[in-house]
């Protein structure tokens, strides 16, 4: 899977979007989860409404929201009040039964407010290190990992 | 009405390799994924694997990994599956079924006739 | 992989009776349970999905139970026609598992 990397501002909102084919995802419930390390386990952040039919109901869980659009195939993901701890690789995910199929890895980086008096040239990255292959772009305030990049820093 | 109709019974040598085929109607063909599922003689069923027809792709019990390969005709709606390097653990009726997800989960409603293939020398 | 168990590999009842079937998971598979019948002649149906949700056009004696590894298949009153081999599925995780079956016998 290509990694598409999406920028926020802090304390702004961060939208991330996820398409997909609609028919081949048919009836399954769909989630955003946060990749823990580079080879850990994906922590499940919120998953769309109990009801497939529902899954255009917005649901939260606290700063981070879901929704979709199970027609024409488009996963949306709100994180609201953006701050450097939300750094980080995460995945949207279409599930069925226990089993969830990765739709599109994502990169967050954080941008400092260049309002906030501090270094405006800030930049969080969840690390840095030697090599991210098949990184792509999305402009929405998106870019795509350049080479020798990884969002992960090296394990020792 | 859905319908499943899977290729005739097939005889074949030990190292050899068969295709067979399911050809289904009633339903829009790419927009269903396909199952396949192995019976041996007087033994329980086996899950092979599926394949989504729309892009061609394909989810494998590990068990059959380079053993069956699944893929699928949108022109004709017709979903193969070749088996390679057979022997008579192979011999088997196999079947292909539409799967649906119901409540969150993937379910054969639809069941072709199976297909027997019986390796021997 | 979740290994299905059905300890019962064949059934003998009488007509009218109430027959159950049971099913064992290796791990807790959330209710995601399928029966299947095959009949003699091969012919493979849908039963149960979900574990106890009843696939349109099949009788109502048939009903279906059970949570976390225990699951189990209820023919309320046996008909000649139920003679078959009932298969239990769990759809939780991949690759899916069936059990390996229960044949149904008239006395």
């Known amino acids: 899977h290509n990694t598409t990397v999406f920028q926020g501002v802090a304390g702004q909102s961060l939208q991330v979007s996820c398409p997909y084919d609609s028919m081949k995802h048919w009836g399954r419930r769909k989630a955003w989860c946060r990749q823990l390390g580079e080879k850990g386990p994906c922590q499940r952040v919120v998953s769309t409404h109990n009801l497939w039919l529902l899954s255009f109901l917005r649901r939260w869980n606290g700063s981070t929201a879901i929704t979709d659009d199970t027609l024409g195939g488009t996963l949306t993901i709100t994180l609201r009040n953006l701050q450097p701890h939300d750094a980080g690789l995460y995945q949207c995910q279409s599930l069925h039964g226990s089993e969830a199929d990765t739709l599109r890895k994502v990169l967050v980086e954080v941008l400092a407010d260049p309002l906030d008096h501090r270094d405006a040239g800030d930049l969080w990255f969840p690390g840095e290190s030697e090599s991210f292959e098949d990184a792509h772009v999305e402009h929405s305030i998106s870019r795509s990992l350049l080479e020798g990049e990884i969002p992960f820093p090296p394990t020792s | 009405q859905v319908q499943l109709q899977e290729s005739g019974p097939e005889l074949v040598k030990p190292g050899a390799s068969v295709k067979i085929s399911c050809k289904a109607s009633g339903y829009i063909f790419s927009y269903s994924w396909m199952n396949w599922v192995k019976q041996r003689p007087g033994k329980g069923l086996e899950w092979i694997g599926r394949i989504y027809p729309g892009d061609g792709d394909a989810d494998y019990n590990g068990k059959f990994k380079g053993k069956a390969t699944l893929t699928a005709d949108k022109s004709s709606n017709t979903a193969y599956m070749q088996l390679t390097s057979l022997t008579s653990e192979d011999s088997a009726v196999y079947f292909c079924a539409r799967l649906h997800i119901y409540d969150g989960y993937y379910v054969s409603v639809y069941w072709g006739q199976g297909t027997l293939v019986t390796v021997s020398a | 992989d979740i290994q299905m168990t059905q300890t019962t590999s064949c059934l003998s009842a009488s007509l009218g009776d109430r027959v159950t079937i049971s099913c064992r998971a290796s791990?807790?598979?959330?209710?995601?349970l399928s029966w299947y019948q095959q009949k003699p002649d091969g012919t493979v149906k849908l039963l149960i999905y979900?574990?106890?949700k009843l696939h349109s056009g099949v009788p109502s004696r048939f009903s279906g139970s059970g949570s976390g590894t225990d699951y189990s298949l209820t023919i309320g009153n046996l008909e000649q026609e139920d003679v078959a081999t009932y298969f239990c599925?769990?759809?939780?995780?991949?690759?899916?598992?069936f059990g390996g079956g229960t044949r149904l016998e008239i006395k």
């Open positions: 599925q769990q759809g939780d995780t991949l690759p899916w598992t």
């Open positions: 791990q807790d598979i959330n209710n995601y």
């Open positions: 979900y574990t106890s």
